[in-house]
Interface confidence: medium
């Protein structure tokens, strides 16, 4: 596929990545799917600098990121290694809490009002952030 060299309209460029910030809410799986359809993925936070950038744009609003443990261990949607990577959990989180009675535990991560991370029930309709890397091959077939 062809390489993406600039960000799509309404996306924000930062450090060779493009970010799109939703203003509505979706369940985590629907947000994940939305980003995939845009040839992107839910945001993967790899540094404190990226954390602060995203935080500035989302404000004090619960917002999904591309981190989940629906299949057991915590995983980033783009394959970035969780164990060795950047983390910014709230104290005592993630806790996979079951006491809410909503069925299952808490398998999806989101930015909380102060930017730190919490795990929550994946059905919550939170805002979300899509990310795609510049210079990566897009999934679109090349123009002939």
């Amino acid at each position: 596929g062809s390489e993406r060299t600039c960000c799509p309209v309404n996306w924000v460029e930062h450090e060779r990545s493009c970010y799109w910030f939703s203003r509505s809410g979706k369940a985590w799986a629907d947000a994940d799917n939305y980003c995939r359809l845009e040839d992107a993925h839910l945001v993967v936070v790899t540094s404190w600098e990226e954390q602060k950038f995203v935080q500035r744009h989302i404000g004090p609003v619960n917002t999904w990121m591309g981190l989940h443990d629906q299949n057991g261990p915590w995983k980033w949607v783009d394959g970035t290694d969780y164990e060795t990577g950047f983390k910014n959990w709230r104290p005592e989180q993630p806790d996979d809490w079951y006491g809410h009675g909503l069925g299952g535990g808490e398998d999806c991560a989101h930015f909380t009002d102060d930017g730190r991370w919490n795990d929550d029930v994946c059905q919550r309709p939170y805002r979300w952030v899509c990310e795609t890397e510049l210079d990566k091959a897009s999934q679109e077939p090349p123009l002939l």
């Epitope: 006491g99 809410h100 009675g101 909503l102 730190r116 309709p125």
Partner: antibody, heavy 120, light 107 residues
Framework: QVQLVESGGGVVQPGRSLRLSCAAS????????MHWVRQAPGKGLEWVAV????????HYADSVKGRFTISRDNSKNTLYLQMNSLRAEDTAVYYC?????????????WGQGTTVTVSS | DIQMTQSPSSLSASVGDRVTITCRAS??????LAWFQQKPGKAPKSLIY???SLQSGVPSKFSGSGSGTDFTLTISSLQPEDFATYYC?????????FGGGTKVEIK
Amino acid sequence: QVQLVESGGGVVQPGRSLRLSCAASGFTFSSYGMHWVRQAPGKGLEWVAVIWYDGSNEHYADSVKGRFTISRDNSKNTLYLQMNSLRAEDTAVYYCARDRGVGYYGLDVWGQGTTVTVSS
Amino acid sequence: DIQMTQSPSSLSASVGDRVTITCRASQGISNYLAWFQQKPGKAPKSLIYAASSLQSGVPSKFSGSGSGTDFTLTISSLQPEDFATYYCQHYLTYPLTFGGGTKVEIK
């Protein structure tokens, strides 16, 4: 047993301030979000504000935003509601209630309420 | 904001009756719904959370059902102590909002 006891209510003139307190006992206060809910005379329940378990996040009903401030002191197991610029329509019984979790899982335990009357 | 509409606003029933109260949300709230009972001069008491989960200590004659926008609280056999006002409340997002209440009176 789990108990919430509100205090600080009374009669106050419009435009003045009042601070309500809610003393918690029988559970680990610092692990739970806390809410204030009010009920005007003869009316239904109205959610007022929430504060997360660690005090980091607060949310308010539009009707009180900018006038009321929710806070907590986990070392004293106490929740507060600072009410400024009071109006006649703030007259109500004010209940504190415990969240089922950190702050967004609904209410389970309620206090007995304290009455606030705003009148000149 | 999400609006919660309860019906009926009041009803008369006899001891032993099966009573059903409905609550409708203005948008889908999954099962983020609670039911409360309030008696005159008393604080509300939690009955049901997550639409259908019974609060600890609440008798099984109370049951809740529904998901999305339409919810029901059922009292299988009304007893004298059940005459009260019942409220639904969503907790999907802030602000949390209550229904207007349903007063259950003795026929």
